[in-house]
Amino acid sequence: QKPSIGKCSVDIQQNRTKTTERPDLLNCPIYWQQVQEKCLLFSHTVNPWNNSLADCSTKESSLLLIQDKDELTRTQNLIHDKAISFWIGLNFSLSEKNWKWINGSFLSSNDLKITGDAKENSCVYISQTSVYSEYCSTEMKWICQKELTLVRNKVSPDSWL
């Protein structure tokens, strides 16, 4: 069983009258790290954008979706080397002539400032300081995300010790 396949989970005490439910715990799979309500996997190896998209899918996740500038900054703060870049889940839709997230939504003009061409076969990557477009066929590291999901785990109180 692969360590990266398991779902991220939040174990929460939903019914506080039941003393056998575990207190709040946040958990991401091995190799993944928690960033607020997401589990992120920063790849070590490299892939074209489409292969990165597929790899995240096999891990029951998606390429990173960035909601706002704050999330971009939080993610960039986890990139410790200026020379390293990561694909995210944003590419150029030729038919709609706009940047499109893999969830189907379009890039809002005030979300991210992308340096580079907006044209066919352009995909977006982030570095420590910036957001760029590049040919989707370029091999790069990538970031997968999983949304944290709610799980109720009942355990005996003495296992909290």
Epitope: K2, P3, S4, S43, T45, D55, K59, E139, W142
Partner: antibody, heavy 121, light 107 residues
Framework: EVQLLESGGGLVQPGGSLRLSCAAS????????MSWVRQAPGKGLEWVSA????????YYADSVKGRFTISRDNSKNTLYLQMNSLRAEDTAVYYC??????????????WGRGTLVTVSS | DIQLTQSPSSVSASVGDRVTITCRAS??????LAWYQQKPGKAPKLLIY???SLQDGVPSRFSGSGSGTDFTLTISSLQPEDFATYYC?????????FGGGTKVEIK
Amino acid sequence: EVQLLESGGGLVQPGGSLRLSCAASGFAFSTYAMSWVRQAPGKGLEWVSAISGVGGTTYYADSVKGRFTISRDNSKNTLYLQMNSLRAEDTAVYYCAKPLDSSLWADFDLWGRGTLVTVSS
Amino acid sequence: DIQLTQSPSSVSASVGDRVTITCRASQGISSWLAWYQQKPGKAPKLLIYYASSLQDGVPSRFSGSGSGTDFTLTISSLQPEDFATYYCQQASVLPITFGGGTKVEIK
């Protein structure tokens, strides 16, 4: 069955060439970066080279840079190591290895049996 | 390159003994350390990955700990089949590097 099977080793003179092959089966070969690792007789493990899943990115240990070339044919599920200008110190068992996760270069959970390369006059 | 220094280079122990092997990295590697077991004439076998995660099928007497630069592999109760050579390996950055190995011998 999930396995890796190396071939192509043998006895070669210093300055000569050999091409090693590693046939993969039982897993999605093209989605994994692959590596060659070697072990000289009675010595420890030494990573030699790695290649990305689609084959466009390669890395080499300093000791083999400029002499060895790693490649792959995903249509044949096969990994290669072309070894030129061989030296006595390249004598070793050569293993191909697959990482545990498709996002990694290392943490090798699958190894071949190895193929022995002997460089001697 | 990141150097990994294993100690001891060899250890003599008896069945049932607790054996501890250490691996020190020349710079911080977070938890990106794996441990392998190798027997003569055989390929290495992954025991522990990401410093402390037990690989599928590996007995629970094997455990790993540590982060940053200092790591430990512990065999809680040595069994006859555990006499072998053990290697640490870092997966933090390329080039991938291995420790020099620790041979666990019968006392």
